[in-house]
């Protein structure tokens, strides 16, 4: 309950915060749990305690372990634990999952990526930023204070972003890197009364007797994820499944999201071996959502065979 996980890379600075909070004037004692050995407060040590903070300048793989902090208040002592893991630097570009900080989401309107844990360090701007190990260049990227701003965010901007900065302690500089994933989410969606794109209202569809015919019902419902949206076909006001004609079946087409962000659905009506009686039916394309229902009616007509006689 009073434990927090911290991690870092060998030869980089790592600063860890005691999970128990107290007043700035409270004394905080730190111990290495395995040996119960007190962590010194003298800054000349590579690992030293500074109030609520435990500093590894720089960190070594052997520093990994559980550290205990005790916040001494006037009436009781609060004990917390910092579970520290120091990893070897990877030779390749990939950042393993165990080194990743929490994923953040952005959108066209809000594309800030905060550099994780940076508030613990004594750093000066600017930060360096990398995406999938490549240094970010171009006017779309702006390093501002402790975060990166991306202008005109696109889905391709999703990926792993690493911030790199220098921690200064008593005139000595130490490198720090931190990586987190960035995902791009759609702007807040909205819902509209359904708009049927096809077929046109009262369309006449020419078909050939004995051949197969397809009718597509296509409608759009708004932008972004839709809570309730459906398209379907009816025959003479009856659902296809209830109509009982095995030659006539409907199957879902592709869910579409156009470049303008509209959320649309398709339903294809497949008529096998078109018969004369099919021309007498009324085919209704229905689109419905929370706003209501829209219906476009189609009728079939016989396609005149091409006259080959002169």
């Amino acid at each position: 309950k009073f434990s927090k996980q911290s991690w870092g890379l060998e030869n980089e600075a790592l600063i860890v915060r005691c999970p128990r909070q107290g007043k700035p004037s409270y004394t905080v004692d730190w111990y290495y749990s395995q040996t119960n050995k007190s962590i010194p407060t003298q800054e000349r040590n590579r690992v030293f305690a500074s109030g609520q903070l435990l500093k590894f300048l720089p960190a070594a793989v052997a520093d990994s372990g559980i550290y205990t902090c005790i916040v001494r208040s006037p009436t009781f002592n609060r004990t917390g634990y910092a579970n520290v893991t120091i990893y070897k630097k990877q030779s390749d570009c990939n950042v393993p999952d165990y080194l990743m900080y929490s994923t953040v989401s952005g959108s066209e309107k809000n594309s800030k990526i905060y550099c994780p844990t940076i508030d613990l360090y004594n750093w000066t701007a600017p930060l360096e930023w990398f995406k999938n190990c490549q240094a970010l260049q171009g006017s779309r990227y702006r390093a501002h204070k402790s975060f990166l701003v991306i202008d005109n965010v696109m889905t391709e901007d999703a990926g792993d972003y690493t911030c790199k900065f220098i921690h200064n302690e008593n005139g000595a500089n130490y490198s720090v890197t931190a990586t987190r994933s960035f995902t791009v989410k759609d702007e807040q969606g909205f819902s509209l009364f359904p708009v049927i794109g096809a077929p046109a209202q009262n369309e006449i569809k020419e078909v050939e007797i004995g051949k197969n015919a397809n009718l597509t019902c296509s409608a759009c419902f708004g932008k972004g994820t839709q809570f309730l949206a459906a398209v379907l076909w009816q025959l003479n006001g009856t659902k296809i499944t209830d109509f009982g004609e095995p030659r006539i079946q409907q199957e879902e087409g592709q869910n579409q999201s156009f470049s303008n962000g509209l959320a649309c659905l398709d339903m294809v009506l497949r008529i096998a071996d078109v018969k004369e009686e099919d021309l007498l039916l009324q085919y209704d394309c229905l689109a419905l959502n929370l706003h209501g229902l829209r219906r476009h009616t189609v009728r079939l007509s016989r396609k005149n065979p091409i006259d080959h006689h002169s």
């Epitope: 007043k23 004037s25 006037p74 009436t75």
Partner: antibody, heavy 116, light 113 residues
Framework: QVQLVQSGAEVKKPGASVKVSCKAS????????MNWVRQAPGQRLEWMGW????????TYGDNFKGRVTITRDTSASTAYMELSSLRSEDTAVYYC?????????WGQGTLVTVSS | DIVMTQSPDSLAVSLGERATINCKSS????????????LAWYQQKPGQPPKLLIY???TRESGVPDRFSGSGSGTDFTLTISSLQAEDVAVYYC?????????FGGGTKVEIK
Amino acid sequence: QVQLVQSGAEVKKPGASVKVSCKASGYTFINYGMNWVRQAPGQRLEWMGWINTYIGEPTYGDNFKGRVTITRDTSASTAYMELSSLRSEDTAVYYCAREGDAFAYWGQGTLVTVSS
Amino acid sequence: DIVMTQSPDSLAVSLGERATINCKSSQSLLYSGNQNNYLAWYQQKPGQPPKLLIYGASTRESGVPDRFSGSGSGTDFTLTISSLQAEDVAVYYCQNDHSYPYTFGGGTKVEIK
């Protein structure tokens, strides 16, 4: 600069619950605990409890245990105080105040009126 | 719980004169671990949240005029306004910042005579 902005005034019926929010800005939210203090009309200030914003551990004053719930959302840098089973004596201004050596930063206050 | 008792309840002082407010705690607010007295003083004006003036019994919060000073140790504490100004008209509270539950005094109303 440090700012604590609280949600607006509420009018509640006896027996109901109220949830007050306190959005922090101008500092790293998880670095400091958040206290809740209330002030009934003509009464002294009364400490309700606080939350360790780093690990989410709350501590409640004895007078409020069982009725108060203090939570936080680190992604929104916001602390919340929910008081249940409201009675007319709970009519008060509720403040959030940042922990430190005493309370140097306070929210503007949220007036909660309990009336049938 | 630590009970904080303030005196007087109200105080009328001429502009430029000294105002003294006392606060007594039912238990010592001195922490032997660091020799700090965990007592704070606040000023509150109508319709506003309290404003921290003094913490640690005698440390002035940054931005607070130096006419405000705090003293005392253990269970007896004093807030002094050396030369009262018109803007100092308010209610003043002492607070136990030592142990839970943090408790406040009943307040002292300072007015101009």
